[in-house]
Amino acid sequence: HEGGQDKPLLSAWPSAVVPRGGHVTLLCRSRLGFTIFSLYKEDGVPVPELYNKIFWKSILMGPVTPAHAGTYRCRGSHPRSPIEWSAPSNPLVIVVTGLFGKPSLSAQPGPTVRTGENVTLSCSSRSSFDMYHLSREGRAHEPRLPAVPSVNGTFQADFPLGPATHGGTYTCFGSLHDSPYEWSDPSDPLLVSVTGNSSSSSSSPTEPSSKTGIRRHLH
């Protein structure tokens, strides 16, 4: 990653997963004290409000539409003449939700489990989603898993969370192959509670097992 430490850092506030019609602030930070930035979209439909524009640290985008979904980068500069732009930032994926009906989310063996018991979350819908995405405490995470047709006519994905330690609130989203950053409405939230011999807890949840390869869109 040549020159990586000089690159700006692009992030989203409050989240890179944005409901349709909502707003998101894109922030470009740096170690070099850049005072102005340009922002561009790498894929999908161009966003006219960004074209040939210069920003100071941040830009509020919205109300977002499906056209805003995609991969963004920023470049920084000091306002010299002529302006010299930095190397591009890290890529930032903006996901737009609320574009399809919500899937349903359930837990096996159930939403209340004993400490150490294996938990699997199943996301399903009658809509022919290609992919499901799991969210925890309102934050989007990987893993994402392909939807598999099931015998009852739904399309389903099973997320193994591994042995339960703490509880948490989960939702899931569906998406299609040709628009991977355009997601459905969230499922109804599912509260997973963990009971132990000494106490029960549904607060202070730990992250899902790293074995599932979970990554955040936003740091």
């Epitope: 409050p14 922030l27 930070r29 170690r31 740091h219």
Partner: antibody, heavy 116, light 107 residues
């Protein structure tokens, strides 16, 4: 495990030069920038600047331009802070720290410099 | 430059008590705030980043909160090893600045 190990305490006279080292281990040295922080006796923390461990390019905070120089010996995974023409007000503990997403996750143990 | 105002400057508390230290910034830094603990004669140790993300290994009695310009770190059920100095730092971009520090002492 990740460690930043700094050189030992220094006692110098005004006008002299000091060079403090910070040896990094346990990670890929060129993947993370290195910062320097000053703490005067009984005072708080003051950011001095940073060095790009890929390119060797330094960036100095406004109060540390002129007499201060950051450098690297990449093959030895070591960063250096040199202060020229020492003054009494340079008496402090100096820390190196590793930067991840613009905050500092690992710090050296500090090098105490006394100018007297 | 972003100014960081930390309060209180010093604080006396007993083991088992709960304390809160606050940090105010001169401009919106969203959630880009870190907290450090420094014990006498030692280097600072990162406790919290992104305003509320606890570093692995830091006891759960510590919690960070806030966004925008108002932030705090709360320590529940103080333990003897929690006493020392605490500093906030914005990680929004250079120049980095630290709060003036809070000295947490045993009552």
């Amino acid at each position: 495990q990740i460690q930043l190990v700094q050189s030992g305490p220094e006692l110098k006279k005004p006008g002299e030069t000091v060079k403090i080292s910070c040896k990094a281990s346990g990670y890929t040295f060129t993947d993370y920038s290195m910062h320097w922080v000053k703490q005067a006796p009984g005072k708080g923390l003051k950011w001095m600047g940073w060095i790009n461990t890929e390119t060797g390019g330094p960036t100095y905070a406004d109060d540390f331009k002129g007499r201060f120089a950051f450098s690297l010996e990449t093959s030895a995974t070591t960063a250096y802070l040199q202060i020229n023409n020492l003054k009494n007000e340079d008496t402090a503990t100096y820390f190196c720290s590793r930067d991840v997403d613009l905050y500092f996750d690992y710090w050296g143990q500090g090098t105490t410099l006394t100018v007297s | 430059d972003i100014q960081m105002t930390q309060s209180p400057a010093s604080l006396s508390a007993s083991v088992g008590e709960t304390v809160t230290i606050t940090c105010r910034t001169s401009e919106n830094i969203y959630s880009y705030l870190a907290w450090y603990q420094q014990k006498q004669g030692k280097s600072p140790q990162l406790l919290v980043y992104n305003a509320k993300t606890l570093v692995e290994g830091v006891p759960s009695r510590f919690s960070g909160s806030g966004s925008g310009t108002q932030f705090s770190v709360k320590i529940n059920s103080l333990q003897p090893e929690d006493f020392g100095n605490y500093y906030c730092q914005h990680h929004y971009g250079i120049p980095f600045t630290f709060g003036g520090g809070t000295k947490l002492e045993i009552k």
